[in-house]
């Protein structure tokens, strides 16, 4: 969490951003909040990116002002206009790409004063893993697949019964480049699995951590998966 304060002249206002991550090929949100003002026409929001000459986005007098917008962001950005009055200056970014990563500044002017805060935006790819029993294998084998990751993640297997066990000797992980030549498909195979046990396939890079669980019994197979973004620090 980054909290910024205004400087000189008018009073300063508190602006708060949260470091976040964008999944390439999806819309992303850059979070920013500020002390609200009672009059929308008195609020100015400017989003800037380090190393970019033009503005990322500007909202003033109750509407978008995009005449100074950098070409890189043309047609891709929006604030939540109906939420600005309550102090939400978050930016929606369409079709996030690797090149969108960097340091952004959320700069706010209201009748109460000015303030700004920086935000570190990471970009990459992350997806839910799916764990299945590989019936084609000669022994009991589990196959963990996740379609899109970047940067290359680590894959670790764990089991409920053998907690703390190292499965690196009985697993094999491969990374296959996807057609757009950026993201990769992750496939990890775990051999010699035992029945009546819950196994977890954990995929992690510096942006996200995802886990796929599978419980195999004689009568049924239960699956569960979840994903969490890392480094959501506020400023």
């Amino acid at each position: 969490l980054i909290i910024g304060f205004g400087i000189s002249g008018r009073h300063s206002i508190t602006v708060t951003t949260v470091a976040s991550a964008g999944n390439i090929g999806e819309d992303g949100i850059l979070s920013c909040t500020f002390e609200p003002d009672i009059k929308l026409s008195d609020i100015v929001i400017q989003w800037l990116k380090e190393g970019v000459l033009g503005l990322v986005h500007e909202f003033k007098e109750g509407k978008d002002e995009l005449s100074e917008q950098d070409e890189m962001f043309r047609g891709r950005t929006a604030v939540f206009a109906d939420q600005v009055i309550v102090g939400n200056a978050s930016l929606r970014l369409k079709n996030v790409q690797l090149t969108d990563a960097g340091t952004y500044k959320c700069y706010i002017i209201t009748s109460k004063g000015k303030g700004n805060a920086n935000l570190e935006y990471k970009t990459g790819a992350f997806s839910m893993p799916e764990v299945n029993v590989d019936y084609n294998a000669s022994s009991e084998t589990l196959r963990c697949e996740a379609p899109r990751w970047f940067p290359q993640p680590t894959v670790v297997w764990a089991s409920q019964v053998d907690q703390g066990a190292n499965f690196s000797e009985v697993s094999n992980t491969s990374f296959e480049l996807n057609s757009e030549n950026v993201t990769m498909k992750v496939v990890s195979v775990l051999y010699n699995v035992t029945i009546n046990n819950t196994y977890s396939c954990m995929i992690e890079n510096d942006i996200a951590k995802a886990t796929g669980d599978i419980k195999v019994t004689e009568s049924e197979i239960k699956r569960r998966s979840h994903l969490q973004l890392l480094n959501s620090k506020a400023s």
Epitope: G25, D64, L66, S179
Partner: antibody, heavy 116, light 109 residues
Framework: EVQLVESGGGLIQPGGSLRLSCAAS????????MNWVRQAPGKGLEWVSV???????DAADSVKGRFTISRDNSKNTLYLQMNSLRAEDTAVYYC??????????WGQGTTVTVSS | EIVLTQSPGTLSLSPGERATLSCRAS???????LAWYQQKPGQAPRLLIY???SRATGIPDRFSGSGSGTDFTLTISRLEPEDFAVYYC??????????FGQGTKLEIK
């Protein structure tokens, strides 16, 4: 040259299924938001479905649960699987690329007629 | 759901005249996510304007877009014979993800 070419349309009975294809050339389908948009005879444009660069999909309420958008990255082709077709699905179906700033490339359209 | 309402439904003008087409949204739309298209009979739509005011590649400068919030305008400064067609505004970003106006037919007077 950047181009989209649809195929697969035709006359189908209510309740039937059809799969539309859209072959792309000159750009990589998986790097863009790819859409299906339809136009009923004499009517306006209606958005049907999207597949994001990530592979996630979304669809209009009118087709959710019946139509499925997908892509084959190796063939650089977009698909629309249409099941449980109704008379009101009769339309020209266009595939269109969203290059971040609008639907800038459209196919020529393929006609789907649902009638008994 | 954001509804886009275009007016007039039909606009009858002569070549050389100025055309002003309106698109009104039921709630605020980001200027970045507002586009205009032209469609001629038997053809696919063609992107004219994106980001409310930026001309797409190859679009003549007689076409211009303006507006913000809930009111957007497409202006054709001097009508050419090939400009007579149906025009649609479109927004991105809400549910449904893409919404089109019902269209304005620009016909020769």
């Amino acid at each position: 040259e950047v181009q989209l070419v649809e195929s697969g349309g035709g006359l189908i009975q209510p309740g039937g299924s059809l799969r539309l294809s859209c072959a792309a050339s000159g750009f990589i389908v998986s790097r863009n938001y790819m859409n299906w948009v339809r136009q009923a005879p004499g009517k306006g444009l209606e958005w049907v479905s999207v597949i994001y660069g990530s592979g996630r999909t979304d669809a209009a309420d009118s087709v959710k649960g019946r139509f499925t958008i997908s892509r084959d990255n190796s063939k650089n082709t977009l698909y629309l699987q249409m099941n449980s077709l109704r008379a009101e699905d009769t339309a020209v179906y266009y595939c269109a690329r969203d290059a971040d700033y609008g639907l800038d490339v459209w196919g020529q359209g393929t006609t789907v007629t649902v009638s008994s | 759901e954001i509804v886009l309402t275009q007016s007039p439904g039909t606009l009858s003008l002569s070549p050389g005249e100025r055309a002003t087409l309106s698109c009104r949204a039921s709630q605020s739309v980001s200027s970045s996510y507002l586009a205009w298209y032209q469609q001629k009979p038997g053809q696919a739509p063609r992107l004219l304007i994106y980001g409310a005011s930026s001309r797409a590649t190859g679009i003549p400068d007689r076409f211009s877009g303006s507006g913000s919030g809930t009111d957007f305008t497409l202006t054709i400064s001097r009508l050419e014979p090939e400009d007579f067609a149906v025009y649609y505004c479109q927004q991105y970003g809400s549910s449904p993800l893409y919404t089109f106006g019902q269209g304005t037919k620009l016909e020769i007077k």
